[in-house]
């Protein structure tokens, strides 16, 4: 389904990070934290849902620890005092590996999914509507933090146009340190006019939200592949597209296409059989010149999760993978608003798409 009126994402924020949750937590709000656990000696990171920036009042402290075989601590801090810890002895994160961490706020609890799999439920100890800030700290690098407010309409068929999303703007720079890691672009380009988050049915008949039933997260949600959706308003400078997923263990290739009518304005084609990331444009069924150069090694790995952030600028698309700038692609089809369709196919499982 589409999520409408959503706060725009924080893109590649530096850690430690604190940012406002516009409107505070609401029943049905889904917050996705996408990043990579650092390989460094640090053994912990934390995501906090808190009141204000002081850290004295944390409704939900989610704290993976790479200690004693690995476990995750969940807790609440009120007026500077911690309550009893809830520990989950399974560790779903790996050092050096990207992750997709999703928090769904519901009336009774937080549901936490890691890489598309339900990991833990944390029952509210304080009223969640007091929360107005998210903070992340510790041994982690962030690609993005996105926010999804549920619509009260059923999910659209996979290949239909997604409902229109209300205008949103990139938020003001949050408090706290906001220096960019090297190789990542500015976090707050010009205002975005629409953001649509695509989530999917986990099984026939099951929906994330209906007017009567509170939204629910199901294990192993999977996007239909190939996944095709409309980019409302097409491309324009400052437009961002975010995708995350997992490369299948036996993957040969996958592709992300930005299309204009019958033409493929931008074809992003990681090829594991060639150890290459090929970029091209197809006009009238005719391919142009391939671009393959990369500033570092192939960033996609079989069996591993990834995030791709495509930022449209006036003259080019900037593409970052797992929060690190990878390449620029000068527009070849330059009538940007007509580039209004996203197609994803090949040997991956998608977990998150935001257009």
């Amino acid at each position: 389904m589409a999520f409408s009126g959503s706060q725009a994402p924080y893109l590649s924020p530096a850690v430690p990070f604190s940012g406002t949750i516009q409107g505070g937590l609401q029943d049905g709000l889904q917050i996705t934290v996408n990043g990579t656990v650092l390989s460094s000696s640090g053994t912990r990171f934390a995501v906090n849902f808190q009141t204000g920036f002081s850290g004295n009042d944390i409704a939900f402290h989610f704290n993976p620890r790479f200690e004693d075989g690995g476990y995750v601590v969940c807790n609440t801090r009120q007026n500077g005092s911690w309550g009893p810890e809830e520990r989950k002895t399974h560790m779903p994160f790996q050092k050096g590996m990207p992750f997709d961490l999703c928090f769904l706020v519901q009336s009774s609890d937080f549901k936490v999914m890691v890489n598309g799999i339900l990991f833990v439920q944390y029952f509210h100890r304080v009223p969640f509507h007091r929360v107005d800030t998210i903070s992340v700290n510790g041994s982690v690098q962030l690609s993005y933090i996105s926010f999804q407010n549920p619509r009260t309409v059923p999910v659209q068929p996979a290949f239909s146009t997604v409902p229109f999303s209300q205008p949103v703007c990139f938020p003001p720079r949050p408090r706290g340190r906001r220096q960019k890691p090297p190789g990542v672009w500015p976090a707050n380009p010009a205002p975005i006019t629409q953001t649509v988050i695509h989530t999917v049915q986990s099984a026939p008949g099951q929906m994330f939200s209906t007017p009567a039933i509170p939204p629910m997260m199901y294990p192993h949600p999977a996007y239909p592949m190939p996944f095709i959706t409309t980019i409302l308003g097409g491309l324009y400078p400052s437009k961002s597209i975010l995708l995350s997923g997992t490369v299948l263990p036996s993957a040969q290739r996958f592709h992300i296409n930005l299309c204009s009518g019958n033409h493929i304005a931008f074809h992003l084609n990681p090829r594991f059989d060639e150890n290459a990331v090929v970029r091209n444009t197809q006009i009238d069924n005719s391919w142009g010149s391939e671009e393959r150069s990369l500033p570092r090694k192939m960033p996609f790995v079989r069996g591993q999760s990834f995030s791709v952030w495509i930022l449209c600028e006036a003259h080019c698309l900037k593409v970052a993978v797992d929060g690190q700038h990878l390449f620029e692609y000068y527009h070849r089809l330059r009538n940007l608003p007509t580039i209004n369709r996203l197609e994803v196919g090949g040997d991956i499982q998608l977990t998150h798409v935001q257009t």
């Epitope: 070849r332 330059r334 009538n335």
Partner: antibody, heavy 120, light 107 residues
Framework: EVQLVESGGGLVQPGGSLRLSCAAS????????IHWVRQAPGKGLEWVAR????????YYADSVKGRFTISADTSKNTAYLQMNSLRAEDTAVYYC?????????????WGQGTLVTVSS | DIQMTQSPSSLSASVGDRVTITCRAS??????VAWYQQKPGKAPKLLIY???SLYSGVPSRFSGSRSGTDFTLTISSLQPEDFATYYC?????????FGQGTKVEIK
């Protein structure tokens, strides 16, 4: 037969404004980008701006950004270049041009040009 | 912006000569280069697009080639009507840029 005809050139004082027109015929106007290219006396070609009439999407050279506005009226098959805050260095013959293919940038059809002189 | 450095700025040649004009791009522009011919008081005419594709109706004595960021326009046997100014243009970047021009004069 494809034709592009520019008009609207003339003498204008520095800081003044002028609007050029480019009347197109012989092809489906909305399907092709329209470019403005200028040539100062005795100098080379300089690309100025481009518009896609179907969407209204535009690009500008840095030298004119914020001063010039390109627009198009698909009902009249005409593109315009509104030039404000004109400077002496904007003196040139202004051509409108169309690419040889809907998705190309090499320009095969050009107007005859219209002279803009910025002088006090 | 991508700069297109054209050389020479002018040359003198005779009818029947082989003439070569070069354009160097300040960065990679793939094959996104066109060549134009312009005569005094006239609008430019498209000769070559995509670095080496001959535009319809252009005589086959004109040819284009690419080596990395260097682009060449060759006139295999100069004809009287070829005396003109020639421009290269890159369209890899949406901000189009032209070379400074090469004037081909009668020796």
């Amino acid at each position: 037969e494809v034709q592009l005809v520019e008009s609207g050139g003339g003498l204008v004082q520095p800081g003044g404004s002028l609007r050029l027109s480019c009347a197109a015929s012989g092809f489906t106007f909305s399907q092709y980008a329209i470019h403005w290219v200028r040539q100062a006396p005795g100098k080379g070609l300089e690309w100025v701006a481009r518009i896609y009439p179907d969407s209204g999407y535009t690009y500008y050279a840095d030298s004119v950004k914020g001063r010039f506005t390109i627009s198009a009226d698909t009902s009249k098959n005409t593109a315009y270049l509104q030039m404000n805050s004109l400077r002496a260095e904007d003196t040139a013959v202004y051509y409108c041009a169309r690419p040889y293919h809907q998705y190309a940038e090499g320009m095969d059809y050009w107007g005859q040009g219209t002279l803009v002189t910025v002088s006090s | 912006d991508i700069q297109m450095t054209q050389s020479p700025s002018s040359l003198s040649a005779s009818v029947g000569d082989r003439v070569t004009i070069t354009c160097r791009a300040s960065q990679s522009v793939s094959r996104a280069v066109a060549w134009y011919q312009q005569k005094p008081g006239k609008a430019p005419k498209l000769l070559i697009y995509s670095a080496s594709s001959l535009y319809s109706g252009v005589p086959s004595r004109f040819s284009g080639s690419r080596s990395g960021t260097d682009f060449t326009l060759t006139i295999s046997s100069l004809q009287p009507e070829d005396f003109a100014t020639y421009y290269c243009q890159q369209y890899y970047s949406p901000l189009l840029t032209f070379g400074q021009g090469t004037k081909v004069e009668i020796k």
